[in-house]
Interface confidence: low
């Protein structure tokens, strides 16, 4: 009696169980009563990552430099190419189809966490006693200058965007 279900790594066709092609290979012809399934390796720029009965291999992903992408891991006959973003960019989405520039933290904000290839810059407001006067993707909030340690006095208070201004102490004679 012809089978109605097949074992793992097999598929049912014409009332018989044929072996699936292994990862990295595509189906050329189904098995028959007398012949095994015929499979062929994927070409250099293609892959198949599962046991399959596909007649075409999938094209490796193209890491398009015009989208800010570069190859992180070259594809094989069994795996797709993995793209990552160029320096200064991070992936738009999990699939990393394109990249966007890291955002800069504006004056008054410092970098809490530097961006990576997959996550954007995280900024934080500069707390009292700290400032940032630049728009930067790397700089943290910097502490106000300590006038006392320089034997000077505060002439102008600092803000979250500006450092304190120190000046000489008025000496009483």
């Amino acid at each position: 009696e012809p089978p109605t279900a097949c074992r793992e790594k097999q598929y049912l066709i014409n009332s018989q169980c044929c072996s699936l092609c292994q990862p990295g290979q595509k189906l050329v012809s189904d098995c028959t009563e007398f012949t095994e399934t015929e499979c062929l390796p994927c070409s250099e720029s293609e892959f198949l990552d599962t046991w399959n009965r596909e007649t075409r291999c999938h094209q490796h992903k193209y890491c398009d430099p015009n989208l800010g992408l570069r190859v992180q891991q070259k594809g094989t006959s069994e795996t797709d190419t993995i793209c990552t973003c160029e320096e200064g960019l991070h992936c738009m989405s999990e699939s990393c189809e394109s990249c966007v520039p890291h955002r800069s933290c504006l004056p008054g904000f410092g970098v809490k966490q530097i961006a990576t290839g997959v996550s954007d810059t995280i900024c934080e407001p500069c707390p009292v006693g700290f400032f940032s006067n630049v728009s930067s993707a790397f700089e943290k909030c910097r502490p106000w200058t300590s006038c006392e340690t320089k034997d000077l006095v505060v002439q102008q208070a600092g803000t979250n965007k500006t450092d304190v201004v120190c000046g000489p102490q008025d000496r009483q004679r």
């Epitope: 398009d64 430099p65 015009n66 989208l67 800010g68 200064g88 738009m92 394109s98 966007v100 520039p101």
Partner: antibody
Framework: QVQLVQSGAEVKKPGASVKVSCKAS????????VNWVRQAPGQRLEWMGL????????TYNQKFKGRVTLTIDKSASTAYMELSSLRSEDTAVYYC?????????????WGQGTLVTVSS | EIVMTQSPATLSVSPGERATLSCKAS??????VAWYQQKPGQAPRLLIY???DRRTGIPARFSGSGSGTEFTLTISSLQSEDFAVYYC?????????FGQGTKVEIK
């Protein structure tokens, strides 16, 4: 509102070159690719190529066989398209159009167009 | 190069009616198709990208669908300002290629 402002109309003789400029107002080109598209009278739109301001990388439509050169001046937020060895069939409106990386090559902002007439 | 073929060449529709425009790619372009509207003397305007994502500010009456080789732009209820030429673009592979356009005219 993002605006791309292109240079004015040009009349050129066959064999000459033309250089069209495209200035971005409100934003710099960072995070965008700049495409160039042309449209001959009554014809479909035709993509000529693009430049990535981040790294200066260019990709051209092979149809133009080295006749087109795309450049960018980031400090002036201006992109340029130069087409050489002009012939009468190059008479067209030339557009610059930008694509944000999150919409790969789906050109979302367009210049007003520059009419280039090639006539002897 | 990938050839994009639009149909019909001209579509005559009455205001308030539905318009369905078709675009076929000569090979698989996945969902990398954009739709543009162009009026005489104006630059094209992006309506839809990635086959079905409506650009910010585009009215909800415009919708896109499809994947692979067959794509559709639907305008659910035509307004007077929608009469124009519509182009599809594949942004899957170089060179990027446009369809020849569909002119939507008043019936």
């Amino acid at each position: 509102q993002v605006q791309l402002v292109q240079s004015g109309a040009e009349v050129k003789k066959p064999g000459a070159s033309v250089k069209v400029s495209c200035k971005a107002s409100v934003y710099s080109f960072t995070g965008y690719t700049v495409n160039w598209v042309r449209q001959a009278p009554g014809q479909r739109l035709e993509w000529m190529g693009l430049i990535n301001p981040l790294n200066g990388g260019t990709t051209y439509n092979q149809k133009f066989k080295g006749r087109v050169t795309l450049t960018i001046d980031k400090s002036a937020s201006t992109a340029y398209m130069e087409l050489s060895s002009l012939r009468s069939e190059d008479t067209a409106v030339y557009y610059c159009a930008s694509s944000y990386y999150s919409t790969p090559y789906a050109m979302d902002y367009w210049g007003q167009g520059t009419l280039v007439t090639v006539s002897s | 190069e990938i050839v994009m073929t639009q149909s019909p060449a001209t579509l005559s529709v009455s205001p308030g009616e539905r318009a369905t425009l078709s675009c076929k790619a000569s090979q698989n372009v996945h969902t990398r198709v954009a739709w543009y509207q162009q009026k005489p003397g104006q630059a094209p305007r992006l309506l839809i990208y990635l086959a079905s994502d409506r650009r910010t500010g585009i009215p909800a009456r415009f919708s896109g669908s499809g994947s692979g080789t067959e794509f559709t732009l639907t305008i659910s209820s035509l307004q007077s300002e929608d009469f124009a030429v519509y182009y599809c673009l594949q942004h899957w592979n170089y060179p990027l290629t446009f369809g020849q356009g569909t002119k939507v005219e008043i019936k």
